[in-house]
């Protein structure tokens, strides 16, 4: 029978190259059965993952999957780094792989990098 464990589908070594000053949505795909778990985002600081408080988050529902979204409105240079989502399910904590944001500061860069340059990162 199908497993009813909560699963977080962030791919290992995933990353996003984004611009400061523009909005971005970081999605954590969540699979669950009956009750939606409590999900949080944290940002890695060395080996510690610091829980993000007072941030704009929301849920998006698709057919067989829900997405817990961390909103960046807009992205800031300090948002550069690695993030992890975690779910609290039946008193257990399930952690995702980390996903990394590479933030380009468009004010310090001479111009926005081209799509080719971004693809080569």
């Amino acid at each position: 029978k199908e497993s009813c464990d909560v699963q977080l589908y962030i791919k290992r070594q995933s990353y996003h190259s984004i611009f400061a000053g523009d909005p971005f949505k970081l999605e954590c795909p969540v699979k669950y059965c009956a009750h939606r778990p409590q999900v949080t985002w944290c940002k890695l600081n060395g080996t510690t993952c610091v829980k993000l408080e007072g941030r704009h988050t929301s849920w998006k529902q698709e057919k067989n999957l829900s997405f817990f979204i961390l909103h960046f409105e807009p992205v800031l240079p300090s948002d550069n780094g690695s993030y992890r989502c975690s779910a609290n399910f039946l008193s257990a904590i399930i952690e995702s792989h980390s996903t990394t944001l590479y933030v380009t500061d468009v004010k310090s860069a001479s111009e926005r990098p081209s799509k080719d340059e971004m693809a080569s990162r």
Epitope: G21, D22, E53, G54, R55, P77
Partner: antibody, heavy 120, light 106 residues
């Protein structure tokens, strides 16, 4: 230097639409966001929405269905369109530049505002 | 949406007096901005990100706070400080303003 200047119709009839143009100078719309904020005696300051540098928009969910923000980078202009105006949309409408520092975002330069009265 | 409640609504102070106004948020926010507005003018940035004074703001102004409680303080009131001060949060859409504190000179 950084400047933003709003131009609007002044008077709008109820149920009609409002169009305001914000013309900016001293910065590029591809690097900075431009926000729309209104101020009415009854509601105080209310953030309406923003045109982000990359061309995406974010809106205040309350008046969102009536709002549309667009821009023309080459003309350094940002446009606000609001449909189905009612008397409580009477306000001063400001366009405002948004800027980020390392770890925060704020609205720094404000236009002088354009007064909009909704009346028949 | 995050509601910002400013108190007091009206504040009267004598020159040289210490002034403190507060802004309380209905939910925790990362930081608070403050704007000053005088009659007939647009709002001006006054304090960024809780405690950073905007360019040209006198050093007698300061800001502090965290979570749901923030404040703006003037160490010694001067006549030119008479204005309405608005707090503003940029943590969650819609990005809201407080109702303002009108500061008057006695």
């Amino acid at each position: 230097q950084v400047q933003l200047k709003e131009s609007g119709p002044g008077l709008v009839a109820p149920s009609q639409s409002l169009s305001i143009t914000c013309t900016v100078s001293g910065f590029s719309l591809t690097t900075y966001g431009v926000h729309w904020v209104r101020q009415s005696p009854g509601k105080g300051l209310e953030w309406l929405g923003v045109m982000w540098p990359g061309g995406r928009t974010s809106y205040n969910p309350a008046p969102m269905s009536r709002l549309s923000i667009s821009k023309d980078n080459s003309k350094s202009q940002v446009f606000l369109k609001m449909n189905s105006l009612q008397t409580d949309d009477t306000a001063m409408y400001y366009c405002v530049r948004g800027d980020y520092e390392y770890d925060y975002y704020a609205m720094d330069y404000w236009g002088q505002g354009t007064s909009v009265t909704v009346s028949s | 949406q995050i509601v910002l409640s400013q108190s007091p609504a009206i504040l009267s102070a004598s020159p040289g007096e210490k002034v403190t106004m507060t802004c309380r948020a209905s939910s925790s926010v990362s930081y608070m901005h403050w704007y000053q507005q005088k009659p007939g003018s647009s709002p001006k940035p006054w304090i960024y990100a809780t405690s950073n004074l905007a360019s040209g703001v006198p050093a007698r102004f300061s800001g502090s706070g965290s979570g749901t409680s923030y404040s703006l303080t003037i160490s010694r009131m001067e006549a030119e400080d008479a204005a309405t001060y608005y707090c503003h949060q940029w943590s969650s859409n819609p990005y809201t303003f407080g109702g303002g504190t009108k500061l008057e000179i006695k």
